[in-house]
């Protein structure tokens, strides 16, 4: 805590200029005003305070504004906003996307902060929904933004926005989440025809049932090994090798190398060995010819 | 994002002379002052001299009026800090520093 002490004869600050920098931490708490700071808070970025500096005019702010910065002071935070506290940030009331970019970019090339996180909260909740423009704007600055979003929280995700989702942004999603996201993006892509459908459908399959995975098969769209081997394991079981083989195309080949890798393993479980012969890859483990198939789970549904 | 790397410092004699440098890439360097500061052994940063990259307006602390001269090069995004007339009070770590970046700082000793 910084004492309250006169300010010098000479040095009241009539503006915030980088002869501040030269100011001992009680000369600045004495000569800065606060009201004059919070105007000019754009010009505080340009100027290479020291953190000690920094927190004597943050001090300043909180003194000012105890329920909150208002938005004309946040939007100009600048690098000051490093020294806000998850805590600070939970009293703002955060509404223009421009805000909230100008706080990104201080941010910019780090991992996502807690206060970072609770700026997004704060803003996203304030929204109600995670419009198109906002998950433009968090997914450009943090790609894995999306997947760190629970399932409760996707389900606020309206169909339109999945447009600003790029295949990258999806990396780190587990089934849970797919499964949220793949039914809107199936929505949102409805109206496009089939390869464009599947270019734009692809990184969400993670999330597709078995009878989307078999429409697709029927439509030459040749699905690479690695966007297979992310489909859900109790989705593929039910596919036929000849469904497989469509789906996959020329990728079909790909099966020998992941043959011990969910879901081919367990998929290959569940095939006749004579189907899978007819690949002519080689694949072994599917069941002996003459074996009776029972679906157990077929069996306790009826019992 | 801007990258700061100092250079020039090392060990002189009171009296002597010493030029430090500031090599700055990545973002144009208009919109930001840029400073060279300085920190004591067991001592608070001090700032030592500023220059407004737009203005030209120069700022020296009073421990070093007359002694230190703080100038840029525009073309080589460099920013210098000519020393003069050392004495050993002025033995410290030299920071440059542009808006919120920091360099990792370069020594300086002045002994006999």
């Known amino acids: 805590e910084v004492e309250k002490t006169a300010c010098p004869s000479g040095k009241k600050a009539r503006e915030i200029d980088e002869s501040l920098i030269f100011y001992k931490k009680w000369e600045l708490e004495a000569c800065v005003d606060a009201a004059l700071l919070a105007t000019q808070m754009d010009r505080v970025n340009a100027i290479p305070f020291t953190y000690e500096q920094l927190d004597v005019l943050k001090h300043k702010l909180d003194e000012l504004y105890p329920q909150g910065y208002p938005e004309s002071v946040i939007q100009h935070l600048g690098y000051l906003f490093l020294k806000m506290s998850p805590e600070d940030i939970r009293k703002w009331n955060v509404t223009s996307l421009e805000t909230l970019k100008a706080l990104l970019e201080v941010n910019k090339g780090h991992e996502m902060s807690p206060q970072v996180a609770t700026l997004i909260d704060r803003f996203v909740k304030g929204r109600g929904q995670l419009d198109k423009d906002t998950l433009d704007t968090l997914t450009a600055f943090y790609p894995g933004y999306l997947c760190s979003l629970s399932p409760e929280e996707l389900s606020s995700v309206p169909p339109s926005s999945i447009w600003a989702v790029r295949p990258q942004d999806l990396d780190t999603c587990d089934p849970r989440q797919l499964d949220v996201l793949y039914p809107k993006a199936r929505l949102a892509f409805q109206n496009m025809n089939g390869s464009e459908y599947f270019v734009k459908i692809q990184s969400f399959l993670g999330g597709a049932p078995t009878e989307d995975l078999k429409a697709l098969s029927q439509q030459n769209v040749s699905m690479d090994l690695a966007t297979f081997m992310k489909l859900r394991t109790d989705a593929v079981l039910p596919l036929t090798v000849a469904e497989v083989q469509k789906l996959l195309g020329p990728h079909v080949e790909g099966l020998k190398a992941e043959e011990r890798h969910r879901p081919v393993r367990d998929w290959i479980l569940r095939q006749r060995q004579d189907d899978l012969d007819t690949l002519g890859l080689g694949l072994q483990g599917g069941i002996p010819n003459g074996y009776l198939v029972l679906d157990l789970s077929m069996q306790e549904a009826l019992s | 994002q801007v990258q700061l790397v100092e250079s020039g410092g090392g060990l002189v004699q009171p009296g002597g002379s010493l030029r430090l440098s500031c090599a700055a890439s990545?973002?144009?360097?208009?919109?930001?002052?840029m400073a060279w500061f300085r920190q004591a052994p067991g001592k608070g940063l001090e700032a030592v001299a500023s220059?407004?990259?737009?203005?030209?307006?120069?700022i020296y602390a009073d421990s070093v009026k007359g002694r230190f001269t703080i100038s840029r090069d525009n073309s080589k995004n460099t920013l210098y800090l000519q020393m003069n007339s050392l004495r050993a009070e002025d033995t410290a770590v030299y920071y440059c520093?542009?808006?919120?970046?920091w360099g990792q700082g370069t020594q300086v000793t002045v002994s006999s």
């Open positions: 520093a542009a808006g919120r970046y």
């Open positions: 990545g973002r144009t360097l208009e919109s930001y002052v």
């Open positions: 220059i407004n990259w737009s203005s030209g307006r120069l």
